[in-house]
């Protein structure tokens, strides 16, 4: 009997009620491999999900998130609301980054501006809600014979504002 079932191709299932003959998957179901005893229910892309690829008898539907949301998880299993750059998502909606913090993405959370002075640098370009500060050379860097060693990673004040 097992041998009969193994002959059933993708898109069908081995129907025990009909002497192991291969029956097509019913509507809104699929089997992506041969020898299946049942077909799986097709994924439905509804609510914040939209259909990227329709379900067929041999493959599941694929979903994306609707406009204003982004995918999380394997095969876009979750959708999370977008915000604008310069904002972060809270339970009460999108909130502007607090002063001294920024977010250059439509998702995620605000993080503090780099503290240039911790590296002995000066602020060359001020930070905004959407962009980090740009640190410029310290006066010592501009003096003759100053080293041009690679600067360390940007420093942040510990415990400073979000994240």
């Amino acid at each position: 009997l097992q041998d009969l079932c193994s002959n059933c191709p993708a898109g069908t299932f081995c129907d025990n009620n009909r002497s192991q003959i291969c029956s097509p998957c019913p509507p809104n179901s699929f089997s992506s491999a041969g020898g299946q005893r049942t077909c799986d229910i097709c994924r439905q892309c509804k609510g914040v999900f939209k259909t990227r690829k329709e379900c067929s008898s041999t493959s599941n539907a694929e979903c994306d998130c609707i406009s204003g949301y982004h995918c999380l998880g394997a095969e876009c299993s979750m959708c999370e609301q977008d915000c604008k750059q310069g904002q972060e998502l809270t339970k009460k909606g999108c909130k502007d980054c607090c002063f001294g913090t920024f977010n250059d993405q439509k998702r995620g959370i605000c993080r503090p501006w780099t503290n240039c002075s911790l590296d002995g640098k000066s602020v060359l370009v001020n930070g905004t809600k959407e962009r980090d500060v740009v640190c410029g050379p310290s006066p010592a860097d501009l003096s003759p014979g100053a080293s041009s060693a690679t600067p360390p990673a940007p420093a942040r004040e510990p415990g400073h504002s979000p994240q």
């Epitope: 999380l72 998880g73 394997a74 299993s77 979750m78 999370e80 809270t90 339970k91 993405q105 995620g108 959370i109 993080r111 503090p112 780099t114 980090d132 990673a153 940007p154 942040r156 979000p162 994240q163």
Partner: antibody
Framework: QVQLVQSGAEVKKPGESLKISCKGS????????ISWVRQMPGKGLEWMGK????????NYSPSFQGQVTISADKSISTAYLQWSSLKASDTAMYYC?????????WGQGTLVTVSS | DIELTQPPSVSVAPGQTARISCSGD??????AHWYQQKPGQAPVVVIY???NRPSGIPERFSGSNSGNTATLTISGTQAEDEADYYC???????????FGGGTKLTVL
Amino acid sequence: QVQLVQSGAEVKKPGESLKISCKGSGYSFSTYWISWVRQMPGKGLEWMGKIYPGDSYTNYSPSFQGQVTISADKSISTAYLQWSSLKASDTAMYYCARGYGIFDYWGQGTLVTVSS
Amino acid sequence: DIELTQPPSVSVAPGQTARISCSGDNIGDQYAHWYQQKPGQAPVVVIYQDKNRPSGIPERFSGSNSGNTATLTISGTQAEDEADYYCSTYTFVGFTTVFGGGTKLTVL
């Protein structure tokens, strides 16, 4: 597809240093937070801290501040968790996970055993 | 930092409803997320942002969150639901994530 692959199990003695890794693939590693989560034997999940690999900004749980260091090298899409002096109480499974609130992808875990 | 308290264990007969609570000061002001962890495996999201269910998670899983308590409800519990469940929240006060202590769900 998105994957987080962690370095292998480690057996260390108290006082030794250790650095474990978490390599991301299949997504823009620089622009997603990576968190580290500890699970001691038979115990629950504990969030240790997170890093934004794009600029290596870190944020720690008060319980782990000063105990561990989280770092990242975005050029090789890898985050790290390190100890300068291990204790027996550091024996645990350590997971890296993508995200800061919703952890949608997890590494397979790195088992760290510290014993004299 | 907020502390999240869960019952260490919950038992339920197959087909019955299991409810797992997660208590914390004003947790309803933050999003709560729920993870399922089976032995030897990494955790998996079963509910995110209080009540949203990822695709691939059975419809019997649902969540709610208000006041000081978030709740994970499993209707028509099945043997395969036996696992440890953890609530978590991200707090904008300390900019940290906190997990509850975990609840072992036993299906009798």
